[in-house]
């Protein structure tokens, strides 16, 4: 059946042998209505991009720099299997490029500039491409040619493969520049000897070198890692304090009419019956006719890649940067430690004005991005597209487990001019029923519940959380009759309750009217018997405070708050009635951004902040009539972090604790990429 | 409520010129922020130049050095300069004050800008 085979891509005689193998030895094992191989022959990966963009192939197995020629438009390709190294338990996907010094040097990655260098070889990813593409733009000019460039930089250096004719220096530390093992200093094990011996200050390889090269931890004390923000960690702390990250060997298909799930079972079923150690008469992971061919002979298994990983978000933005620099050859005009414009995630078309009119009011120095839900603009900053946002806590583990850091906290309760060096201790996340309503924490079963949204702390993680802990299972929808959680499954129980408008029904932004603190307490209003939200929010909408229709004529002693001991009590009374205690909002970036972030930030609240009176003829900053845009209405001022400024310390160990057992029940499909 | 009306599109050359007029009902005076926004077909609707009450002023890249905007407080008009206009500058132009639009819906009717030879 031409729909279920999987027409493989192979670039040599060679592969196009094993591809045949392959494709006759499946036919073996798999039954006659599932998955089945056909092979085409291109002369290069290359052609097999544009074979399987153009729909002549459907699959080839690509390494990291040939996964970015495959996402560069027109050829749009994505990433859909991973080959993984070292253990089943314990998978290797990813490697990460790292800059190894010595410990008792003093320079940082910014002062790398008259140093002398170490490298695996020229054109190699870990050795020369990822460090040299993230400090092109610190390279003097005229940067081409490269080598010449990157001689002029360092002091001297050492790049097995580089024209030590042309380039003298880059040979400086081991002459002639010899490109095998007859170098002391070739490749991973060479370029880190480099440094060990005292020829070079720097060495650029990859995480495992140092662990493989030097077995006694007493031994690896003496180095430490670069980090990017210009700090040092030690050589275990690689995962904080890379270069890069850098995808080993990876399968990619079209990103619309892919098959992704037919070449999941296809390799699935191969890695099954002829992985490693599985078969005599055909072996996925070696050939008796050349090396890595269709695959990695090192590999010992394949993983699905998450269906929400992107070809960005799977390089990284980091390599990303690394190469795009190295191939465009383009640098900003302005000095890389000069703070651009940020760029601020906006969800959809409500928070979008709000930005454009901040961005006016900052004459350019906030520019705005948009996105239609909050997961997609914490991958559109992580990739880069854009930089900053604001969120809920559930958001903030996300964002945190997305690579990103907190930078400044939304405060509500602390009155300026003390605001801005204030650590509040958060706000209460309550259960709020009708007064009329014989509602308690204990008989909640088969009511109509209210959200914020799904993910978000005080109307899902904490309530969610006490609930999972209650029923142990994660089947919320069969708990409540039904209900608006904007994110849910919009076939779910947990989306009959929104209220829209269609299409953007139980969408989780403000185009769904029942969306955010506001929008589930109206959803209670008119239709639910419970609404999961902050402690502020009936006061915040009931007394005539909030003057839409809905709203105006409500009263607060019409709503009361569930306590856990099954008790209710007036909403005046949180901290005396709450389900659990709520990290306050807080700003996120990525670590590259977040100094310029946290500058940007203060100074536009010192003009557009608190301060500002008349939010009808002044732009404000943290107004917008109840609807929560960009910053949540109640914020007094965005405080500064402190030491807090990683999501573990911000959120706390509770909290954090707490969301963490929710992620058996997660429906994130960013965190289930993030965690890839 | 203020109401706001988009008046002076029109089909123009490339390379020609165009000033559109926002005139509003009522004082925009108080109005924080006012906006050109345009919204070509199929595409979503986007800034093209902004103005404060104290006249700072942002332009969408694409504009910049070929638009200019403009308001009069005392007659209620923000105004839209367009010069050396290029055939993907088309779309419906429509003029917004900040206060009331984001978060409900008010847009007037939009004035069509056309530039094509």
């Known amino acids: 059946v031409p729909e279920k085979s999987v027409r493989w891509c192979a670039v040599s005689e060679h592969e196009a042998t094993k591809c045949q193998s392959f494709r006759d030895h499946m036919k073996s094992v798999l039954p006659s209505n599932g998955p089945s191989v056909a092979c085409v022959k291109k002369a290069s990966h290359l052609d097999c991009i544009r074979a399987i963009a153009a729909n002549e192939a459907d699959a080839v197995t690509l390494d990291a720099g040939l996964v970015y020629d495959a996402y560069l438009a027109p050829n749009n390709l994505k990433p859909v299997v991973a080959e993984f190294y070292g253990s089943k338990e314990d998978p290797q996907t990813f490697y990460y490029a790292v800059a190894v010094v010595k410990k008792d040097s003093d320079f940082q990655m910014n002062q790398l500039r008259g140093r002398k260098s170490c490298h695996t070889g020229l054109g190699r990813s870990a050795g020369w491409n990822i460090p040299i593409g993230l400090l092109y733009c610190d390279l003097p000019e005229p940067r081409k040619p490269l080598e010449k460039a990157v001689a002029n930089f360092f002091s001297g250096s050492c790049v097995p493969c580089a024209d030590g004719t042309d380039f003298p220096q880059l040979c400086q530390l081991c002459p002639g520049c010899g490109c095998s093992t007859l170098n002391q200093y070739f490749s991973y094990s060479g370029a880190f000897k480099c440094l060990k011996d005292g020829a070079g200050d720097v060495a650029f390889v990859k995480h495992s070198t140092i662990f493989e090269n030097l077995a006694n931890k007493a031994d690896r004390d003496q180095y430490e890692l670069l980090c990017l923000d210009n700090t040092r960690k030690s050589v275990d702390e690689y995962k904080d304090c890379h270069l890069a990250r850098v995808p080993s060997h990876t399968v990619v298909a079209r990103s619309v009419g892919g098959k992704e799930d037919l070449i999941w079972e296809l390799l699935n079923q191969a890695q099954e019956h002829f992985g490693k150690d599985k078969s005599k008469e055909f072996q996925l992971f070696s050939s008796p006719h050349g090396k890595d061919l269709l695959f990695k002979d090192s590999a010992h298994g394949f993983l699905k890649v998450p269906p929400r990983m992107d070809a960005k978000m799977y390089l990284g933005y980091e390599y990303i940067t690394a190469i795009r620099n190295l191939r465009e050859g383009t640098c900003p005009e302005a000095p890389t430690d000069e703070c651009k414009p940020v760029k601020w995630c906006a969800l959809s078309h409500h928070e979008r004005l709000k930005c454009d009119e901040w961005s006016v009011n900052s004459a350019g120095k906030i520019e705005c991005e948009s996105a239609e839900t909050t997961e997609d603009c914490i991958a559109k900053i992580m990739n880069g597209e854009a930089d900053a946002m604001s969120l809920d806590g559930g958001f903030v583990y996300i964002a945190g487990m997305c690579g990103l850091v907190p930078v400044l906290a939304e405060n509500y309760n602390t009155p300026n001019p003390n605001c801005e060096n204030t650590a509040e201790e958060g706000y209460f996340a309550v259960a709020v029923v009708k007064s009329s309503s014989d509602l308690t924490w204990d008989n909640l079963k088969g009511k109509k519940s209210c959200h914020t949204a799904v993910g978000r702390t005080a109307g899902w993680n904490i309530p969610m959380g006490l609930l999972y802990s209650k029923i142990n299972h994660c089947r919320f929808d069969e708990f409540f009759s039904e209900g608006c959680a904007p994110g849910s499954e919009k076939n779910s129980s947990l989306c009959k309750l929104c209220m829209g408008p269609s299409p953007n029904l139980c969408e989780p932004n403000n185009k769904e009217g029942y969306y955010g603190y506001t929008g589930a307490f109206r959803c209670l209003v008119e239709k639910g018997d419970v609404a999961f939200v902050k402690h502020q929010t009936v006061p915040q909408n009931t007394g005539g405070k909030n003057p839409d229709a809905w709203a105006k004529n409500l009263k607060e002693e019409d709503y009361e708050l569930l306590c856990l001991d099954g008790s209710r009590k007036s909403v005046q009374e949180p901290a005396n009635c709450h389900l659990a205690r709520a990290p306050n909002h807080a700003v996120v970036a990525r670590k590259d951004k977040a100094d310029c972030v946290q500058t940007l930030l203060l100074d536009q609240q010192r003009m557009f902040g608190s301060s500002v009176t008349d939010c009808s003829s002044n732009f404000c900053l943290f107004e917008s009539k109840t609807k929560d845009l960009l910053f949540r209405d109640d914020t007094v001022c965005l405080a500064k972090l402190h030491d807090r400024n990683t999501y573990e310390k911000y959120l706390g160990e509770e909290y954090v604790k707490a969301v963490t057992n929710l992620r058996k029940c997660s429906t994130s499909p960013l965190l289930e990429a993030c965690t890839f | 409520q203020v109401q706001l009306v988009e008046s002076g599109g029109g089909l123009v050359q490339p390379g020609g010129s165009l000033r559109l007029s926002c005139a509003a009902s009522?004082?925009?005076?108080?109005?924080?922020?006012m906006a050109w926004y345009r919204q070509a077909p199929g595409k979503q609707r986007e800034l093209v130049a902004g103005?404060?009450?104290?006249?700072?002023?942002k332009y969408a890249d694409s504009v910049k050095g070929r638009f200019t905007i403009s308001r009069d407080n005392a007659e209620n008009t923000v105004y839209l300069q367009m010069n050396s206009l290029k055939p993907e500058d088309t779309a419906v132009y429509y003029c917004?004050?900040?206060?009331?639009?984001?978060?409900?819906?008010?847009w007037g009717q939009g004035t069509q800008v056309t530039v094509s030879s």
């Open positions: 103005i404060t009450r104290g006249g700072t002023t």
């Open positions: 009522g004082s925009i005076g108080s109005s924080a922020t």
């Open positions: 917004t004050d900040y206060s009331r639009s984001y978060y409900e819906d008010h």
